[in-house]
């Protein structure tokens, strides 16, 4: 899994007038890391591990750089021609990655009112845009502005690739990023569904990184995809993640089912409780 830095800048307009504030959220290796507004950036440590790593670092440099980026994005929003009444948003998402083989990727994406209308590969400088006419109109509008205004916006849009990677490398070097593995807690619960049927749910929580396999098996054999329902893998607010998978089974058949979990090279299987007993032994490898 590559190391990554992701900036999400948002500016707003109201009745055609660009608002003075901006909001930037920065994710480091998929974790909420910084949250910045016009005044300052604040570290957003999630749980004790982040506080330990981030310490009392001040974020003056990030505040300065991201304030500049916010101004640039506000200028871009001001040049979008189809400003209508009411509230509108322009979002710029920038992502850079450093892979295990030291290769890099970086890209930039623009969203207007939450809809993607323009992307750029920051390494090849190649632009792409969706097919819809609205997206294409917006894209042409913004691209033209960025070309015309390249001097005024400093070299922000051209140096972003290098800047993002430089910042990511700086964070990695300073030890902000911990390559850590936190195994999930897995528990299986049952609830009555309809007469003779029960829904069994397997929940994994408190794990990091986010990649996980969670699935139901009957008689040891994986159930087909369409007989299972999966929840999204979501942050749980502690710098870790949670998810679930559920399936419906006949009451009395519990002993034939196990939940299979795979995370960061570790595996475990978890049986279904019969009746009301919930504490069950699991097999960890």
């Amino acid at each position: 899994e590559p190391h990554s830095l992701r900036y999400n800048l948002t500016v707003l307009s109201w009745d055609g007038s660009v608002q003075s504030g901006f909001l930037t959220e920065v994710h480091l290796d998929g974790q909420p890391f910084l949250r910045c507004d016009r005044q300052k950036c604040r570290a957003k440590p999630q749980g004790q591990w982040a506080e330990d790593v981030l310490g009392n670092k001040t974020w003056d440099r990030e505040t300065r750089d991201l304030t500049g980026n916010g101004k640039d994005l506000r200028m871009t929003l001001a040049h979008i021609k189809d400003q209508k009444e009411g509230l509108h948003s322009l979002q710029e998402i920038r992502v850079c990655e450093i892979h295990e083989d030291n290769s890099t990727r970086s890209s930039q994406h623009f969203y207007y009112d939450g809809e993607l209308f323009l992307s750029q590969n920051l390494e090849t400088k190649e632009w792409t845009m969706p097919q819809s006419s609205r997206a294409q109109t917006l894209a042409m509008n913004v691209r033209n502005f960025l070309k015309e205004d390249a001097m005024k916006t400093k070299t922000h849009y051209h140096a972003m690739h290098a800047d993002c990677l430089q910042e990511l490398r700086r964070y990695l070097k300073s030890g902000v990023v911990l390559r850590r593995t936190v195994p999930p807690m897995v528990n299986v619960t049952r609830s009555e569904a309809s007469e003779g049927n029960i829904t069994v749910t397997c929940r994994a929580s408190g794990f990091y990184p986010w990649n996980i396999t969670l699935s139901w098996r009957q008689d040891g054999v994986s159930l087909s995809h369409d007989t299972q329902q999966w929840g999204d893998v979501l942050p749980d607010g502690n710098g870790t993640y949670q998810t679930w998978v559920a399936t419906r089974i006949c009451q009395g058949e519990e002993q034939r089912f196990t939940c299979y979990m795979e995370h960061s090279g570790n595996h475990s299987t978890h049986p279904v409780p019969s009746g009301k007993v919930l504490v069950l032994q699991s097999h960890w490898q």
């Epitope: 098996r217 009957q218 008689d219 040891g220 054999v221 009395g252 058949e253 519990e254 002993q255 034939r256 089912f257 196990t258 595996h267 299987t269 049986p271 409780p273 019969s274 009746g275 007993v277 069950l280 032994q281 097999h283």
Partner: antibody, heavy 118, light 107 residues
Framework: QIQLVQSGAEVKKPGASVKVSCKAF????????MNWVKQAPGQGLKWMGW????????TYADDFKGRVTFTLETSISTAYMELSRLRSDDTAVYFC???????????WGQGTLVTVSS | DIQMTQSPSSLSASVGDRVTITCSAS??????LNWYQQKPGKAPKLLIQ???LLHSGVPSRFSGSGSGTDYTLTISSLQPEDFATYFC?????????FGGGTKVEIK
Amino acid sequence: QIQLVQSGAEVKKPGASVKVSCKAFGYTFTNYGMNWVKQAPGQGLKWMGWINTYTGEPTYADDFKGRVTFTLETSISTAYMELSRLRSDDTAVYFCARNYGNYLFDYWGQGTLVTVSS
Amino acid sequence: DIQMTQSPSSLSASVGDRVTITCSASQGISNYLNWYQQKPGKAPKLLIQYTSLLHSGVPSRFSGSGSGTDYTLTISSLQPEDFATYFCQQYSKFPRTFGGGTKVEIK
């Protein structure tokens, strides 16, 4: 600590029946099924079937259907295997094994030797 | 029924040797395979489930691999307590069937 404790060795005459018990300790008996496995002297392992300890429903392997019966006494966390119309080739060690997810045998009893001899 | 054929049926090895036991299924079993170890006069013990997943408490010198119809149990450095008989078991289909066993003896 999880343990399965089986009844002692039996010597039977051909045509008789034998009933082997398997008492479970250290876990909730009705959360896991129970398998029965036969091992003839110097031979491999042969699965006889399993019983759902929650519903009491047995599943028998074809080779043993009609001669074997699995039963339960859940109040004392015990499973039973009864084999009838015994023949000399039924001489074997019979194991109970906890049925985890109906695909693996994660804890085994110590085995019960049944000798069929005239 | 799915037939499980183990080879060799017996082998002699010394402490520290690398030992490989194979198990071949009469049809594809999609990695649905377990391995057990049995010592004389004792019940079998689960070693590996689902082809390669070590059961809790099993030393890391044991490993499993394979796919389709052919599967392998490897002991990277044989220890005195590893002299025993090893069985594979498929759970792709009912009835559950075991291999004939491989006896690992002291050379």
